[in-house]
């Protein structure tokens, strides 16, 4: 602790100019004071002035008023500094002396004589208010006031709390009257060294080094650092955690750059044909009769759809066709028969039923056969019952679907998620693809399962050819070349006629 006991001498009266021993001063009592401050004593005793002592120069003769003086000789109030915790109690001895010698340093003069002395004992709290008092004896009167204040930068009831206002990186604060810290605007913490970030700045994803700032941690962006940054190269996708690429509807692939809804976005099928999406950038056109080609852009011969039934032969004509019917059949498509059940027209064990009073017939075919005369074996795969590229196989009276990897179910309609067992390490994001799961790794990791810590940028050497885009962190060898249309190979070095269905992994 550190403080100052201040004593203000106001007036001294010694009208008769007498000393304590009853003698008078000649020509008058040239008066100076000795002050001794010590710890509280119920009975004041001689001994060291434990809290300090001070002497004045000659302040006047006999009776006088003491003026305030801020500096130099004769300073008033008198200052008694201390470097300890103020105990709240004290003893004070004020002695008035006559000196025949030097005005400025009467202490050193021989022949000094005591005029009077007063002793004050009691309690005194630290504060700015002066306590005023007056002491009389038979010959003299002394008016004075006193107080205890803390030294600069010391605070509290006993001047024991040190506090120095500061505004640097170890604190931004001012000092309260009790010595506690009062943080400057924008700062918080026990030592006011923690900045208060921009209001709303995300607690985990943002931070600040000065007030009203919001600096985003890796993987986050936006004014309040509450928006994640998707994976580098993510085209048609979003994220809910950093470096993710969750595809928008209709898009697929590692970077959501593969069009799963090619039919809607590009309408590739011509001449009224039906378009079916079939995987990334894949589609199938189902042509109307009379058209062919990948996009049904080619017109067929009118006979291409085999319109003539019952073995009739078709002849193309300018805008139509003509059916030449075999014996026993007639009609535009040879659909009418002149045969009856008597002619045994039903093949492969079909049963004949007469119609129209025997003038025509109908065949009821056994299983696995069809046609008006049961002449055709049933192909149960014609309706394309297998989904997701499954292969249809006839098995006697039934058919089965042989599914591609990643699919199951009677019609290969169920997707098996390779990501269900969370194969990606270090927070990698899993994507189900045709050839198994692929992991999108966070910054600093690579490998098929993000198990490899990257120590260098594998793309820095420019390993991809033909304008391909290089990505790191997606494979054990640390980079992936995403080939442009017309190129394949681990580094997109081979030109081809067909687009690759998926980026080659180096």
């Amino acid at each position: 602790g550190s403080g100052i006991f201040q004593l203000r001498l106001q007036e001294f009266v010694n009208q008769r100019g007498m000393l304590a021993n009853g003698q008078s001063c000649e020509p008058g009592c040239r008066t100076f004071f000795r002050i001794c401050l010590k710890h509280f004593q119920a009975t004041f005793s001689e001994g060291p002035c434990t809290f300090g002592n001070v002497s004045t120069p000659v302040l006047g003769t006999n009776s006088f008023v003491v003026r305030d003086k801020n500096s130099g000789s004769g300073r008033n109030p008198l200052q008694l500094p201390f470097n300890f915790t103020w105990p709240g109690t004290f003893s004070l001895n004020i002695q008035a002396w006559h000196t025949p010698g030097d005005d400025l340093r009467p202490e050193t003069s021989p022949g000094n004589s005591l005029i009077s002395q007063i002793i004050i004992q009691g309690s005194l709290a630290v504060g700015k208010i002066w306590r005023t008092d007056e002491q009389n004896d038979t010959l003299t009167r002394l008016s004075y006031s006193y107080r205890v204040i803390c030294s600069d930068n010391y605070y509290g009831e006993s001047c024991s709390r040190l506090c120095k206002k500061r505004d640097d990186h170890f604190g931004h604060y001012e000092c309260q009257p009790d010595g506690s810290l009062s943080c400057l605007p924008g700062w918080t913490g026990k030592y006011c060294d923690q900045p208060i970030c921009l209001s709303g700045c995300h607690e985990q994803n943002g931070y600040c080094s000065k007030p009203d700032e919001c600096i985003c941690r890796p993987g986050w962006q936006g004014r309040l650092c509450n928006e994640c940054i998707p994976h580098n190269g993510c085209r048609h996708g979003t994220c809910s955690i950093p470096w993710q690429c969750a595809c928008d509807e209709g898009w697929g692939g590692l970077f959501c750059d593969q069009d799963l809804n090619y039919c809607t976005h590009h309408s590739p099928c011509k001449n009224g044909s039906t378009c079916s999406n079939s995987g990334p950038k894949g589609y199938t056109c189902t042509c109307l009769p009379g058209y062919t080609g990948e996009h049904c852009e080619l017109g067929l011969s009118k006979c291409a759809s085999n319109p003539c039934r019952n073995g009739g032969s078709c002849k193309d004509q300018e805008n139509s066709y003509h059916c030449l019917c075999p014996p026993g059949y007639y009609g535009q498509h040879c659909e009418h028969s002149t045969l009856t059940c008597a002619d045994s027209p039903c093949f492969n064990g079909g049963s004949c039923r007469e119609r129209n009073q025997g003038s025509s017939y109908a065949c009821e075919c056994p299983p696995n056969f069809t046609g008006s005369n049961c002449e055709k074996k049933v192909d149960r795969c014609t309706s394309n019952p297998c989904a997701n590229g499954g292969q249809c196989q006839n098995r006697g009276p039934s058919r089965t679907c042989r599914c591609r990897p990643g699919f199951t179910g009677t019609h290969c309609e169920l997707h098996i998620s390779d990501c269900a067992r969370s194969p990606c390490a270090h927070g990698g994001t899993c994507h189900d693809l045709e050839n198994g799961p692929v992991c999108t790794c966070p910054a600093g990791f690579s490998g098929r399962r993000c198990e490899v810590r990257i120590t260098h940028d594998a793309c820095a050497s420019g390993p991809c050819f033909n304008g391909a885009t290089c990505y790191t962190g997606l494979s054990p060898n640390n980079f992936v070349c995403n080939c442009p249309y017309g190129f394949v190979g681990s580094r997109c070095e081979f030109p081809v006629g067909l687009p690759p269905s998926f980026p080659w992994v180096a």
Epitope: D152, K164, R166, H169, F170, G189, Q194
Partner: antibody, heavy 121, light 106 residues
Framework: EVQLQESGPGLVKPSETLSLTCTVS??????????WGWIRQPPGKGLEWIGD???????YYNPSLKSRVTISVDTSKNQFSLKLSSVTAADTAVYYC?????????????WGQGTLVTVSS | SYELTQPPSVSVSPGQTASITCSGQ??????ASWYQQKPGQSPVLVIY???KRPSGIPERFSGSNSGDTATLTISGTQPMDEADYYC?????????FGYGTKVTVL
């Protein structure tokens, strides 16, 4: 107990960049309430404060060196680093790293053992 | 720039009191720290916040700071106290060291 260890080349050519790393063990560099500083002492002379950094990357530099100094932190490795560019013979000194404590009002309670860097061709 | 001035050397007899001063403009309004450095060793903090001792520092080391002067006092000086002593304070965001005082125990 917290320990600090300086590392880096002991000899640097004039006009090149001096690079040193301080590795902190026995405590986390990411603790709040600390700054991590660099101080140097030319042979036979006094201490000179170079600059400091906290775990968030807030840096403060001695104005007399500011144009040449960069201090960075790598919390994942519990390290902080000093780069001093365009060095001259006057940059020859023992370089210390130290922990500055907010509770100690900026006093440095832990120091590295120092590493002598000589600038000479 | 802010400067802290120390006497280059102070001599003291064993058992006597050594006082080292450190002067700077309004230094009393800043927190002063003191470091002891022996030859070939790193500095050691002996006083922080003007007058506080870190654990392990002997009681004979004390400090004060007011006005323009901070003082490190070593009472009952021992031969092992022979070392260089540096005062340090912060001027805004810059650390400032005094020039150092060599204490010789005669």
């Amino acid at each position: 107990e917290v320990q600090l260890q300086e590392s880096g080349p002991g000899l640097v050519k004039p006009s090149e960049t001096l690079s040193l790393t301080c590795t902190v063990s026995g405590g986390s560099i990411s603790s709040s309430g600390y700054y991590w500083g660099w101080i140097r002492q030319p042979p036979g002379k006094g201490l000179e404060w170079i600059g400091d950094i906290n775990y968030r990357g807030s840096t403060y530099y001695n104005p007399s060196l500011k144009s040449r100094v960069t201090i960075s932190v790598d919390t994942s490795k519990n390290q902080f680093s000093l780069k001093l560019s365009s060095v001259t013979a006057a940059d020859t000194a023992v370089y210390y790293c130290a922990r500055e404590d907010v509770i100690l009002r900026g006093g440095s309670d832990y120091w590295g053992q120092g590493t002598l860097v000589t600038v000479s061709s | 720039s802010y400067e802290l001035t120390q006497p280059p050397s102070v001599s003291v007899s064993p058992g006597q009191t050594a006082s080292i001063t450190c002067s700077g403009q309004r230094l009393g309004d800043k927190y002063a720290s003191w470091y002891q450095q022996k030859p070939g060793q790193s500095p050691v903090l002996v006083i922080y916040e003007d007058s506080k001792r870190p654990s392990g520092i002997p009681e004979r080391f004390s400090g004060s700071n007011s006005g323009d002067t901070a003082t490190l006092t070593i009472s009952g000086t021992q031969p092992m106290d022979e070392a260089d002593y540096y005062c340090q304070a912060w001027d805004r965001d810059t650390g400032v060291f005094g020039y150092g005082t060599k204490v010789t125990v005669l």
